[in-house]
């Protein structure tokens, strides 16, 4: 396993709809053509896997159906964005790159982003 | 908006190094690729070097690539350029630039992919 550098901003603010976006790079050694991106999720000191996609370099990424998160990729980047987020999902999210074909393997982690989650304030009664 | 300022260029003898920074005001520098470009007496401004905004990713004119190192420092707002193995033909002025937009993936030697740039500062090789 050789390591690999990623990059990912370091905080995020995520809308009021709960939608956050951010951006994974990473630092491709060779001419990868099989890639894996997983969106790890910590908070306090417990790391949980959110999403992940493996691509062909060049296409779409593709989620499972029921996954909160959707992305694209272009060269040595991908936009990735997730869904349904809400206040107790504030936390460090993390990227992982690993290049899975063909060989050797690299593996690359990103610092991670912190996503802030606010929730809406519900909108007040109306007499009208 | 964004000032570049460009420092460390000089006069040096061939085979000499040089080592020029770029320090950029505002709080986005993380999000935008980095350049440096050079324009020597009498001729077109040209790409020298570039570097990803998350620092990941270098890219290199051919005619600097193995002489000239790009980095950068997000903490510090900065964007440097080693020079080494400086030869008489690459005495002119350096620009730094800064990419036009956050988190591009549209990695280019382009002028027209960068928005802002610096005043430049002279470098001189001497043979």
């Known amino acids: 396993c050789k390591a690999m550098h990623v990059a990912q901003p370091a905080v995020v603010l995520a809308s009021s709809r709960g939608i956050a976006s951010f951006v994974c790079e990473y630092a491709s050694p060779g001419k990868a053509t099989e890639v894996r991106v997983t969106v790890l999720r910590q908070a306090d000191s417990q790391v949980t896997e959110v999403c992940a996609a493996t691509y062909m370099m060049g296409n779409e990424l593709t989620f499972l159906d029921d996954s909160i998160c959707t992305g694209t990729s272009s060269g040595n980047q991908v936009n990735l964005t997730i869904q349904g987020l809400r206040a107790m999902d504030t936390g460090l999210y993390i990227c992982k790159v690993e290049l899975m074909y063909p060989p050797p393997y690299y593996l690359g982690i990103g610092n991670g982003t912190q996503i802030y989650v606010i929730d809406p304030e519900p909108c007040p009664d109306s007499d009208f | 908006e964004v000032q570049l300022v460009e420092s460390g260029g000089g006069l040096v003898q061939a085979g000499g190094s040089l080592r020029l920074s770029c320090l950029a005001s505002?709080?986005?520098?993380?999000?935008?690729?980095m350049g440096w470009f050079r324009q020597a007496p009498g001729k077109e401004r040209e790409f020298v070097a570039a570097i990803s905004w998350g620092g990941v990713n270098t890219y290199y004119a051919d005619s600097v690539k193995g002489r000239f190192t790009i980095s950068r420092d997000n903490a510090k707002n900065t964007v440097y350029l080693q020079m080494n193995s400086l030869k008489p033909e690459d005495t002119a002025v350096y620009y730094c630039?800064?990419?036009?937009?956050?988190?591009?993936?549209?990695?280019?030697?382009?002028?027209?992919?960068?928005?802002?740039w610096g005043q430049g500062t002279q470098v001189t090789v001497s043979s």
């Open positions: 630039a800064r990419g036009s937009a956050p988190y591009s993936s549209s990695r280019s030697s382009a002028q027209e992919t960068y928005a802002q």
């Open positions: 505002g709080r986005t520098f993380s999000s935008y690729d």
